[in-house]
Interface confidence: medium
């Protein structure tokens, strides 16, 4: 066995093993997505997180899982069975993915102001229509999750929520905000949420009560809600995690480039090996 053949054999099994790993990973991601879609309650208790945007994540996970499984399967079978067409398809899919990521990167860096404004507009729309449209629960859950994780409230200010008619206090009633705005660590009282979740929720109908993240909390006089708007929170988060984000993106990009190089190398050299083997047959 020549050096080239052993090298190709090594690449072949390397591609097979790595793609097998990604196939398993993809199937796990897909299973999680399906689990969330079928049984949200058991998933929430398993993860132990509040304000998880399940509706969006279930679909994102399922689609990502299928996509990962598909690409990995092409790589696995293509490498193991030494099928040029599958390896070529695998290379093409990775190239498409890589090109998409590059394009997105360029768009994000050049169109930052427009993207920020679009995000603000989406958030404002979500805030304005909060708890009124069953079609918008995915966006609402996602925004609740952002507020909960980034410890912020509203876009510019927590008061952004007071523009929502169903959340506006009248007379002796306090203004209201989604419970994801509530800073539970700011109070020693573990029962605070029980106290502030409004008994008047029934007024908002089944829409608001149909999901945990639409729980609406009163704002006490000395409020325990996050004081910072999420615009600042997101900026801080991006600033603090910029190196990690860039690192992950570069890592994924290099991994894709690596697999692309190996697959095209294997693809192009399979003929030479076959020709040589035919000579000795």
């Amino acid at each position: 066995m020549s050096a080239q053949e052993s090298c190709l054999s090594l690449i072949k099994y390397f591609l097979f093993v790595f793609n097998l790993f990604f196939f398993v990973l993809g199937s796990l991601i897909f299973c999680f997505g399906i689990w969330i879609l079928i049984d949200k309650t058991s998933f929430v208790s398993f993860v132990g997180l509040a304000f998880v945007p399940l509706q969006i994540w279930s679909k994102v996970l399922a689609i990502s899982g299928i996509f990962t499984m598909g690409i990995a399967l092409l790589g696995c079978v293509g490498a193991l069975k030494e099928l040029r067409c599958l390896l070529g398809l695998y290379f093409g899919m990775l190239l498409l993915l890589f090109a998409t990521q590059i394009t997105l990167g360029i768009l994000i860096s050049t169109q930052r102001a427009q993207l920020e404004r679009s995000l603000r507009d989406v958030v404002e729309k979500t805030i304005q229509k909060y708890g009124t449209n069953p079609e918008e629960t995915a966006a609402e859950e996602s925004w609740d999750y952002v507020q909960f994780q980034l410890r912020c409230c509203g876009w510019h200010y927590p008061q952004d929520w007071f523009q929502v008619l169903i959340l506006r206090g009248n007379g002796s009633e306090a203004h209201r905000v989604p419970c994801s705005c509530y800073n539970l660590s700011a109070t020693n009282d573990s029962t605070i949420l029980d106290k502030v979740i409004l008994p008047q929720l029934s007024r908002l109908g089944h829409l608001a009560r149909s999901r945990h993240s639409a729980d609406i909390c009163a704002v006490p006089a000395e409020s325990h809600i996050y004081r910072e708007g999420c615009a600042q929170g997101l900026q801080k988060w991006l600033h603090n995690n910029l190196i990690s984000i860039v690192g992950i993106c570069l890592g994924v990009g290099l991994l894709e480039l690596g697999f692309m190089t190996l697959s095209i190398f294997l693809c192009r050299n399979l003929d030479h090996v076959y020709n040589r083997l035919a000579r000795y047959r």
Epitope: W155, H156, R168
Partner: antibody, heavy 119, light 107 residues
């Protein structure tokens, strides 16, 4: 920190026009609307209009419509208010103030620009 | 246009006093009311927005309340730096309108 710095005092003749500038710093200029408010001596504050610096959309008080023009230069993070066909009752301090949205409070104000209309 | 009528127009009080300024709108403004403080020769400063929410950094002695057409600004214990003119404003519909102001003076 957030700062709104307005141009200096102006003395203008009746019938002429005046352009007051307001330079913003310490925040993303296109993220907040810019209001213009008039305060004549001994009078209540009067809202003149506002601009959304992101797209240049303006909303004016009908009382000033036709005479007031609000513009912006995003590259210089500056908003402008031009008032034309000036008369003696336009003698006032003009303030710029930022607001996250149109229908919202004005959380930061400029120092004010005194415009005196005198022949 | 929505008219905002403030009362009283002027008010004399002493340090430590509890002071209440009222603002009446000519129609329901659904808590879309701000309160501003202005000292002579200075620009106005936001105190309260959405009728009852104190702006960042505003002392807790300032509080706002109200609904519908009637709104109130209360200063629980007057401090020397609180003597100024106070304005209410509605941002419910354009044109946004201010009250005529309440001048708070030292007795």
């Amino acid at each position: 920190q957030v700062q709104l710095v307005q141009s200096g005092a102006e003395v203008v003749k009746p019938g002429a026009s005046v352009k007051v500038s307001c330079k913003a710093s310490g925040y993303s200029f296109t993220d907040y609307n810019m209001y213009w408010v008039k305060q004549a001596p001994g009078q209540r504050l009067e809202w003149m209009g506002y601009i959304d610096p992101y797209n240049g959309d303006t909303t004016y008080n009908q009382k000033f419509k036709g005479r007031v023009t609000i513009t912006r230069d995003t590259s210089a993070s500056t908003a402008y208010m031009e008032l034309s066909s000036l008369r003696s009752e336009d003698t006032a301090v003009y303030y710029c103030a930022r607001s996250p949205y149109g229908h919202y409070a004005m959380d930061y104000w400029g120092q004010g620009t005194l415009v005196t209309v005198s022949s | 246009d929505i008219q905002m009528t403030q009362s009283p127009s002027s008010l004399s009080a002493s340090v430590g006093d509890r002071v209440t300024i009222t603002c009446k709108a000519s129609q329901d403004v659904s808590t879309a009311v701000d309160w501003y403080q202005q000292k002579p020769g200075k620009s106005p400063k936001l105190l309260i927005n959405w009728a009852s929410t104190r702006h960042t950094g505003v002392p807790s002695r300032f509080s706002g309340s109200g609904s519908g057409t009637d709104y109130t600004l209360t200063i629980s214990s007057l401090q020397p730096e609180d003597f100024a003119t106070y304005y209410c404003r509605q941002h419910y519909s354009t044109p946004f309108t201010f009250g005529q102001g309440t001048k708070l003076e030292i007795k």
